[in-house]
């Protein structure tokens, strides 16, 4: 029997019946065996076919076989109900070999010309399968010349059989207190030849509960327990399963915080698998009872390990653990079923005893000594000599624990001394002056420190004076002996004050005229205001209307009198303001240098002389009565004048205070 070409020779060619295209002889038998390379098949088709027709092709025939399988037995010229002629059909080998057998019997009724066929090797597309047949590959099939290969979707790995995709389903660890896990692809069929391991690992103290949900379908066997595919559940205490079949397993209360779930599948079957919903429980903690005036959040039916609650107090109540305040409180349930900290109290906010108000007092409005939330107190200043600055003195104990004014201020009100009060009625006639009576000049300050000078009290801790009077002590403020509240210069009965700092106007030049002859002394303590010690007011913007030419001002001091000695008793003099041009002119003639009188000065005195301030009065205040407020204010500071006090045609020269209000305010606010 002739053999066809064998691989690796080119596999293609022609076959024909003996004698073709002539008629074939009787009693012929020919066999051709064609072999293609692995992964290839043989294709065969006929270009001519003319054989004797017989029932079931018993007489003459061409038989095509591939391995043990007969592909076709052919005869005749055209197919009938029981016989087949190739016509235009193409035949394919099942593997890489094809056997062709031609046979003719002992006779032919008429001449038949036989057949001619052509064959060739072609690649098998292993990826194409007939309907109903198992696919070549589990997931993806890739054909190539002479063969094919399989690959898998993400999350799978090719089994060593090179066709099955096993799920990569191990190593998943679930750490949440509840969750779901299922067989791969659920609810679609689970993969073959897979071994899945899932771990649930919760904190110690939790117990895992497993519920099988929806559906359960794992390949089973009627007699043997789960021989093919199975699900097992393992804890540190016991093993549950194996499970298979179609019945949902019962709830499993593992009493363990760690669970391992194993799912193993074989190479066959088509089942949807399983789904587990897991929860956890733990020993519950005692139900938290909110303290009075507080509430628990969140509210739960029960609280187990890791659950927590917070306490929130009503407005006006605060969290306290004993005496210690807390801004927030959260307790956490522990594995032994106890809370990690005890319940605090919600105590009513207590603002505590209010601070004492210097030069004032406090009154409990709500009730004696009541200092809790919403309690009201009233601050007031000592009448006559002090007045409350800014607020009305009413304070409420607010939820934040601070006494708070109606304007929202948490700081104490300020009792500011009332300024410009005097016992004196205007009228009456230092040089050429009169003795002051108690309370006439309560702002008068005696400054001793090398020389005798004066000043005027501002507020309760500042003294306004002349720069030239304290220039020598500017770097040694503590050397100044400051006395107030007395009329007699040498009296042992006075209020002593000491200087903390001396501020001399930066525009003042010592021994070069008296421009900017103004200074402030800061006292190291506040003085107590009374009828004999009261500050002078600073001039209002409108004050100039009370300081026009010929308006009367009052100067006071212990300076030289007509007798040429320092006064023992405080003296004062009422003197009119002098026209500025007139005063300037009076000091233009020698021995005074030109420009001695500046716009920062004002002059006062009589043209005829006799009434003046003198040496020892320096730094004292020239005061005026503001008839609108009925308070005295400082218009001038005793600065300089003629060598002979009270000289006719010469005037006392005073620092014009209204020009220095910004300077004074800046120093006082900064220091």
């Amino acid at each position: 029997t002739p053999l066809g070409p064998k691989w690796p020779e080119p596999v293609f060619g022609r076959l024909a019946s003996p004698g073709f295209p002539g008629e074939y002889a009787n009693d012929q038998e020919r066999r051709w065996t064609l072999t293609a390379p692995p992964g290839y098949r043989l294709r065969l088709y006929f270009t001519h076919f003319d054989l004797e027709l017989s029932h079931l092709c018993e007489y003459d025939f061409v038989k095509l076989s591939s391995g043990a399988k007969v592909l076709a037995t052919l005869c005749g010229q055209e197919s009938t109900d029981t016989e087949r002629a190739p016509g235009k059909d193409t035949f394919y080998s099942l593997g890489s070999s094809l056997d062709i057998t031609f046979r003719s019997d002992y006779s032919n009724e008429k001449p038949f010309t036989g057949f001619e066929a052509f064959y060739a090797a072609e690649d098998i597309d292993e990826c194409q399968v007939a309907p109903g047949e198992a696919p070549t590959c589990d997931h993806h099939c890739h054909n190539h010349l002479g063969g094919f290969y399989c690959s898998c979707r993400a999350g799978y790995v090719l089994h060593r059989n090179k066709r099955t995709c096993s799920a990569l389903c191990s190593g998943q660890v679930f750490t949440q207190r509840s969750g779901e896990l299922s067989s791969p692809e659920y609810p679609r069929p689970y993969p073959k030849l897979s071994s899945c391991t899932y771990s649930i690992s919760l904190e110690e103290g939790f117990s895992v509960i497993l519920d099988f949900v929806e559906s359960f379908d794992v390949e089973t066997h009627p007699e043997t327990l789960c021989p093919y595919d199975f699900l097992k559940i393992q804890t540190d205490r016991e093993e549950h399963g194996p499970f298979c079949g179609k019945t949902l397993p019962h709830r499993i209360e593992t009493k363990s915080n760690t669970v391992t779930i194993t799912f193993v599948t074989d190479e066959s079957g088509d089942h949807t698998g399983w789904k587990i919903h897991y929860t956890s429980t733990a020993q519950p903690c005692p139900y938290p009872m909110a303290p009075p005036n507080g509430h628990v959040s969140p509210v739960q039916a029960k609280y187990i390990l890791k659950d927590s609650f917070s306490i929130f107090c009503e407005t006006g109540y605060e969290l306290l653990q004993g005496h210690l305040p807390l801004k927030s409180f959260t307790a956490v349930c522990q594995k032994d079923g106890s809370w990690d900290r005890p319940m605090p109290a919600c105590s009513i906010v207590d603002c505590g005893p209010p601070d004492d108000l210097p030069s004032g007092r406090v009154e409990y409005i709500t009730g004696p000594g009541v200092t809790t939330y919403k309690a009201v107190i009233q601050y007031s200043c000592e009448e006559t000599f002090y007045t409350m600055k800014v607020n009305d003195g009413k304070y409420v104990c607010e939820a934040d624990g601070f006494w708070t004014s109606s304007k929202g201020e948490k700081s104490l009100p300020v009792c500011e001394p009332v300024c410009g009060l005097s016992a004196r009625t205007t009228g009456g006639r230092i040089y050429g002056g009169q003795k002051a009576k108690p309370g006439d000049f309560p702002w008068q300050v005696l400054i001793l420190g090398g020389t005798t000078a004066a000043g005027a009290l501002l507020y309760d801790n500042w003294v306004l004076t002349a720069a030239h009077a304290v220039y020598e002590q500017k770097h040694d403020a503590s050397a100044l002996d400051i006395r107030m509240g007395t009329l007699k210069r040498l009296s042992p009965h006075y209020t002593q004050a000491w200087s903390e700092a001396v501020f001399i106007h930066e525009g003042y030049t010592h021994d070069a005229g008296f421009d900017n002859d103004i200074a402030l002394i800061k006292l190291n303590n506040k003085v107590v205001i009374n009828s004999n010690i009261t500050p002078i007011c600073l001039p209002r913007k409108e004050a100039e209307s009370f300081m026009r030419t010929d308006d009367i001002g009052t100067a006071s001091g212990w300076g030289l009198t007509q007798r040429g000695f320092l006064a023992r008793n405080l003296m004062y003099v009422d003197i009119p303001i002098v026209d500025h041009q007139k005063c300037t002119a009076a000091y233009e003639k020698p021995p005074y240098p030109r420009g001695s009188v500046t716009a920062n000065m004002l002059c006062a005195g009589l043209e005829s002389g006799g009434k003046d301030s003198c040496r020892g009065d320096s730094g004292g205040a020239l005061v005026f009565l503001d008839s609108e407020t009925e308070r005295w204010f400082v218009g001038g500071i005793v600065s300089w004048g003629s060598m002979n006090c009270g000289e006719a045609g010469q005037y006392g020269v005073y620092t014009k205070v209204i020009n220095y209000i910004p300077w004074i305010e800046n120093i006082i606010s900064d220091f």
Epitope: Q321, P325, L326, K327, R341
Partner: antibody
Framework: DVQLQESGPGLVKPSQSLSLTCTVT?????????WNWIRQFPGNKLEWMGY???????SYNPSLKSRISITRDTSKNQFFLQLNSVTTEDTATYYC????????WGQGTSVTVSS | DIVMTQSQKFMSTSVGDRVSVTCKAS??????VAWYQQKPGQSPKALIY???YRYSGVPDRFTGSGSGTDFTLTISNVQSEDLAEYFC?????????FGSGTKLEIK
């Protein structure tokens, strides 16, 4: 990690004021809790002096109330102790601390009152 | 002021033993009591708060108990590093007050 650190002069003259600073790192003094000053005398006796709370409210030991002031600077996360008119009896190691809910103490600073 | 009395100034024990340090309040302080351990040259370190709650990181051989006026710190299985002075403290009311201390000596 929460840390408290005391600082201030180690020697103070009688009748003067003692001023100490506690610098807190790792936690804001306005977030929660009471921020305390505690002192330990020679012989180890401990005395609570007072606190300033997260809200700025103060509570003082009544035995010191006329002399003590506790303040804070929230921008620097510091709180301060001022004790006026000190005597030799105020010689001690001074600690700043959070008590109760969290427990953190400074390492302490030794203050001697002596002329 | 509430006085916290630690009647035993010194206590002697051996490694592995169990020892109880007591503290008595002069009036009811509920459970608002803390226990402190102070080793020489160190700041006090809190062990227990609210009478029986252990601070995190404190070994479980330290146990606190009591309420009202009588309080106990128990150290089971005493270790050599437990050599220290132990103070109780009440924070129930102003002023907060400390006990005078109990020194634990290891035999």
């Amino acid at each position: 990690d929460v840390q408290l650190q005391e600082s201030g002069p180690g020697l103070v003259k009688p009748s003067q004021s003692l001023s100490l600073t506690c610098t807190v790192t790792g936690y804001s003094i306005t977030s929660d809790y009471a921020w305390n000053w505690i002192r330990q005398f020679p012989g180890n006796k401990l005395e609570w002096m007072g606190y300033i709370s997260y809200s700025g409210r103060t509570s003082y030991n009544p035995s010191l109330k006329s002399r003590i002031s506790i303040t804070r600077d929230t921008s620097k996360n510091q709180f301060f102790l001022q004790l006026n008119s000190v005597t030799t009896e105020d010689t001690a190691t001074y600690y700043c601390a959070i008590l109760y809910a969290m427990d953190y103490w400074g390492q302490g600073t030794s203050v001697t009152v002596s002329s | 002021d509430i006085v916290m009395t630690q009647s035993q100034k010194f206590m002697s024990t051996s490694v592995g033993d169990r020892v109880s340090v007591t503290c008595k309040a002069s009036q009811n302080v509920d459970t608002n009591v803390a226990w402190y351990q102070q080793k020489p040259g160190q700041s006090p370190k809190a062990l227990i708060y609210s009478a029986s709650y252990r601070y995190s990181g404190v070994p479980d051989r330290f146990t606190g108990s009591g309420s009202g006026t009588d309080f106990t710190l128990t150290i089971s299985n005493v270790q050599s590093e437990d050599l220290a002075e132990y103070f109780c403290q009440q924070y129930n009311s102003n002023p907060l007050t400390f006990g005078s201390g109990t020194k634990l000596e290891i035999k």
